[in-house]
Interface confidence: medium
C-alpha cells in the first residue's frame, strides 16, 4: 500500500472519487468543476459561499469524468503555497469506502428514509444545513464509523441536489466535504493510523502482509 | 426511541455501564473543533444526546484533532457535467436508500434577506418548523438538521461498533487457527508504523 | 437450525413491570438485528422496534417510547423487552423476529402471550 | 408514518380457485436508488407466528410454493394465489419495510367455502 507518511492522503481525492461513485449508484455522471481546497493545516481561500443556482447540467462526453479530472491534485490556497505533499490515495482506501458506505446505506436505508423527510434543501439552505448538521455529528467527538456516516451524509446532499435539479450544488457539497475533512478531521485521522487503519478496519479482514 | 436502560444523554462504557464524566473514555473526547460558521468558542461539553442516542458499545479510535480557525467557504465556478444513465438504475443492488419527496422542477427561492417572504416562502417556512415540531421524541424547537445529525451520530457509533467487534473477532479467531498469520500481521504494524515515522 | 424461543405466556398486573425474552439459536447472535412486533386479538400487527445485539444500539417506533426497553445479552444469546407501567391495553401476544439482511423478517419466534389482569 | 391498507379484508374461496388480495401504501415503497419496493407478504395461520412470503413486493421466500405471487409498484400491490388449496387459509398480512416505523396492514383473511 502506498506511504502517507505524516501528511496523509489527498482528502479531495477520496471526496471526489466518492461522490462520483454514489451518483453513479443513481445513474448520474459528474464531472467535478475546480472544487479546490486547501491541504490540510492550510489557509482557507477568502471568499464566501455562492450557491449559483444559475447553474444547469450539460450532457456529458462519453470520457471517464473521474478520468478528466485525474490525477485531482489540490489547488493550494492563497498564502499555501508551501503546503505539505499529499500522496496520492491507493485504490484500496477507496474501495474499502465505498464498501463501508454501502453497507452503511443497506443498513440505515430507513433511517435516511426517515430522515429524508426532514432534509428541505434549497440553494440558499444547503450550506447551513450541511454546516449544522456535520457540526453536531462530530459535537462530542469522532470514530470511523461517525466518519463512514458524514461520507453518506454528503453523498446524499449531492444526490438529492440532482434530483432537485440544484446540481450545481454539487461541487459545493464536495467542498465542503473536503474542507472539513482537511480542517477538523484531518488530525483525527493521521492520530488514529491514517486512512490505512480505515482499511484495515473496514476492509477485507485477512491481506498479505503488504499490499 | 425505546428507552434505553440508562439515560439517553448518558455515555457508556463496553458493558453499557454510565459513565461519568471524569472516566469518560479518551478514545472520544468532548468538543470536536467541528463548527463551520464560527470561531472556535472553547470545548463546551457535548452530550451524547438526541432522540436516537443509545449506548454503542464499540469506542470511536482516539483523539480528537486540536481546534482549527474555521473560515468561510470559497466556492469557485462549478462546472458540471451530468448525464441520465438508466441502464445504470438497476445496476446497485446495495440498497441505497433513496429521496422520495416530490421532485420540483425549480427549487424554490426563499431568501432571508428579505423583508416580506412571499406567500409560498411563508408556507415552505411553516412546513418545515412544522416538521420539526411533529416529532413526539424531541423538544418541539428542536431543528430538523439537529435531529439528523443526532441520527446519524447514533447509526455512526452503532456501524463502529460492529466494525470494531468484526476485527477484534477476526483478530481473535486468526490467532487461534493461523498463530504465524497473526505475528506477519504484528510485523506488518510495526513496519508501517516505523515506515510512517521516517 | 435457527430458533427463537419465548415463554407461552405471562401473567402480570396493572403497573407493574415484565421482561420478555427470546432466545436465539443455530446462527450467530450479533450478526442479525432482532425485532420485537405486538398483535393484539383483532388488531393486527404493530412493531414495537429493533436492537442490534452487537452494539446494543435501538430504533424504535415513537409510539412505543416511554413502554419498551429493548437490551439483550450477548453471552446467551437473548434478546430481551421490558414493558412497564402495564395496562389491560400491554395485553397481547409479543413476537421476536430475526431481520435478514436488514430487508425483511425470515425467522420469528413462537410468541409469548402477555396478560395484564389483577 | 405509512399507512398500508389491505382490501378486501376478508375471502371466502373455494379449493383450487384463484384470489388476489390489495395492499395500498400511503406514500410509495419504491426506492428508486435499486428499483426495489420494499413492500413484504406475511401469512400467518391461528395460533402460529407470521411466515414470510413475498419480499420486495415481488421476490419469493425459498420454500414458498410458486402459486404465491407478489407484483405491484409504487403504492399499489397485490399478492395472487392461484390454484388456492386448504393449508393456504390464513390471514394475510402486507407490510411497509421502506421506513421507520416498519407498518402492517390490517390483514386479508382467507376462508374456504
Known amino acids: 500500500m502506498a506511504h502517507a507518511g505524516r501528511t496523509g492522503y489527498d482528502n479531495r481525492e477520496i471526496v471526489m472519487k466518492y461522490i462520483h461513485y454514489k451518483l453513479s449508484q443513481r445513474g448520474y455522471e459528474w464531472d467535478a468543476g475546480d472544487v479546490g481546497a486547501a491541504p490540510p493545516g492550510a489557509a482557507p481561500a477568502p471568499g464566501i459561499f455562492s450557491s449559483q443556482p444559475g447553474h444547469t447540467p450539460h450532457p456529458a462526453a462519453s470520457r471517464d469524468p473521474v478520468a478528466r479530472t485525474s490525477p485531482l491534485q489540490t489547488p493550494a490556497a492563497p498564502g499555501a503555497a508551501a503546503g505539505p505533499a499529499l500522496s496520492p490515495v491507493p485504490p484500496v482506501v477507496h474501495l474499502t469506502l465505498r464498501q463501508a458506505g454501502d453497507d452503511f446505506s443497506r443498513r440505515y436505508r430507513r433511517d435516511f428514509a426517515e430522515m429524508s423527510s426532514q432534509l428541505h434543501l434549497t440553494p440558499f439552505t444547503a450550506r447551513g444545513r450541511f454546516a449544522t448538521v456535520v457540526e453536531e455529528l462530530f459535537r462530542d467527538g469522532v470514530n470511523w464509523g461517525r466518519i463512514v456516516a458524514f461520507f453518506e451524509f454528503g453523498g446524499v446532499m449531492c444526490v438529492e441536489s440532482v434530483n432537485r435539479e440544484m446540481s450545481p450544488l454539487v461541487d459545493n457539497i464536495a467542498l465542503w466535504m473536503t474542507e472539513y475533512l482537511n480542517r477538523h478531521l484531518h488530525t483525527w485521522i493521521q492520530d488514529n493510523g491514517g486512512w490505512d487503519a480505515f482499511v484495515e478496519l473496514y476492509g477485507p479482514s485477512m491481506r498479505p502482509l503488504f499490499d | 426511541m425505546a428507552k434505553q436502560p440508562s439515560d439517553v444523554s448518558s455515555e457508556c462504557d463496553r458493558e453499557g455501564r454510565q459513565l461519568q464524566p471524569a472516566e469518560r473514555p479518551p478514545q472520544l473526547r468532548p468538543g470536536a473543533p467541528t463548527s463551520l460558521q464560527t470561531e472556535p468558542q472553547g470545548n463546551p461539553e457535548g452530550n451524547h444526546g438526541g432522540e436516537g442516542d443509545s449506548c454503542p458499545h464499540g469506542s470511536p479510535q482516539g483523539p480528537l484533532a486540536p481546534p482549527a480557525s474555521p473560515g468561510p467557504f470559497a466556492t469557485r465556478s462549478p462546472l458540471f457535467i451530468f448525464m441520465r444513465r438508466s441502464s445504470l438504475l438497476s445496476r446497485s443492488s446495495s440498497g441505497y436508500f433513496s429521496f422520495d419527496t416530490d421532485r420540483s422542477p425549480a427549487p424554490m427561492s426563499c431568501d432571508k434577506s428579505t423583508q416580506t417572504p412571499s406567500p409560498p416562502c411563508q408556507a415552505f417556512n411553516h412546513y418545515l418548523s412544522a416538521m420539526a415540531s411533529m416529532r413526539q421524541a424531541e423538544p418541539a424547537d428542536m431543528r430538523p438538521e439537529i435531529w439528523i445529525a443526532q441520527e446519524l451520530r447514533r447509526i455512526g457509533d452503532e456501524f463502529n461498533a460492529y466494525y470494531a467487534r468484526r476485527v477484534f473477532l477476526n483478530n481473535y479467531q486468526a490467532a487461534e487457527d493461523h498463530p504465524r498469520m497473526v505475528i506477519l500481521r504484528l510485523l506488518r504494524y510495526i513496519v508501517r508504523l516505523v515506515w510512517r515515522m521516517h | 437450525q435457527v430458533q427463537l424461543q419465548q415463554p407461552g405466556a405471562e401473567l402480570v398486573k396493572p403497573g407493574a413491570s415484565v421482561k420478555l425474552s427470546c432466545k436465539a439459536s443455530?446462527?450467530?447472535?450479533?450478526?442479525?438485528?432482532m425485532h420485537w412486533v405486538k398483535q393484539r386479538p383483532g388488531r393486527g400487527l404493530e412493531w414495537i422496534g429493533r436492537?442490534?445485539?452487537?452494539?446494543?444500539?435501538?430504533k424504535s417506533n415513537e409510539k412505543f417510547n416511554n413502554k419498551a426497553t429493548l437490551t439483550v445479552d450477548k453471552s446467551s444469546s437473548t434478546a430481551y423487552m421490558q414493558l412497564s407501567s402495564l395496562t389491560s391495553e400491554d395485553s397481547a401476544v409479543y413476537y421476536c423476529?430475526?431481520?435478514?439482511?436488514?430487508?425483511?423478517?425470515?425467522?420469528w419466534g413462537q410468541g409469548t402471550t402477555l396478560t395484564v389482569s389483577s | 408514518d405509512i399507512v398500508m391498507t389491505q382490501s378486501p379484508s376478508s375471502l371466502t374461496v373455494t379449493a383450487g380457485e384463484k384470489v388476489t388480495m390489495s395492499c395500498k401504501s400511503s406514500?410509495?415503497?419504491?426506492?428508486?436508488?435499486?428499483?426495489?419496493?420494499?413492500l413484504t407478504w406475511y401469512q400467518q395461520k391461528p395460533g402460529q407466528p407470521p411466515k414470510l412470503l413475498i419480499y420486495?413486493?415481488?421476490t419469493r421466500e425459498s420454500g414458498v410454493p410458486d402459486r404465491f405471487t407478489g407484483s405491484g409498484s409504487g403504492t399499489d400491490f397485490t399478492l395472487t394465489i392461484s390454484n388456492v388449496q386448504a393449508e393456504d387459509l390464513a390471514v394475510y398480512y402486507c407490510?411497509?419495510?421502506?421506513?421507520?416505523?416498519?407498518?402492517f396492514g390490517a390483514g386479508t383473511k382467507l376462508e374456504l367455502k
Open positions: 436492537i442490534d445485539p452487537n452494539s446494543g444500539g435501538t
Open positions: 420486495w413486493a415481488s
Open positions: 406514500q410509495s415503497l419504491l426506492n428508486s436508488g435499486n428499483q426495489k419496493n420494499y
Open positions: 443455530g446462527y450467530t447472535f450479533t450478526s442479525y438485528w
Open positions: 423476529a430475526r431481520w435478514w439482511d436488514y430487508d425483511y423478517f425470515d425467522y
Open positions: 407490510q411497509n419495510d421502506y421506513n421507520y416505523p416498519l407498518t
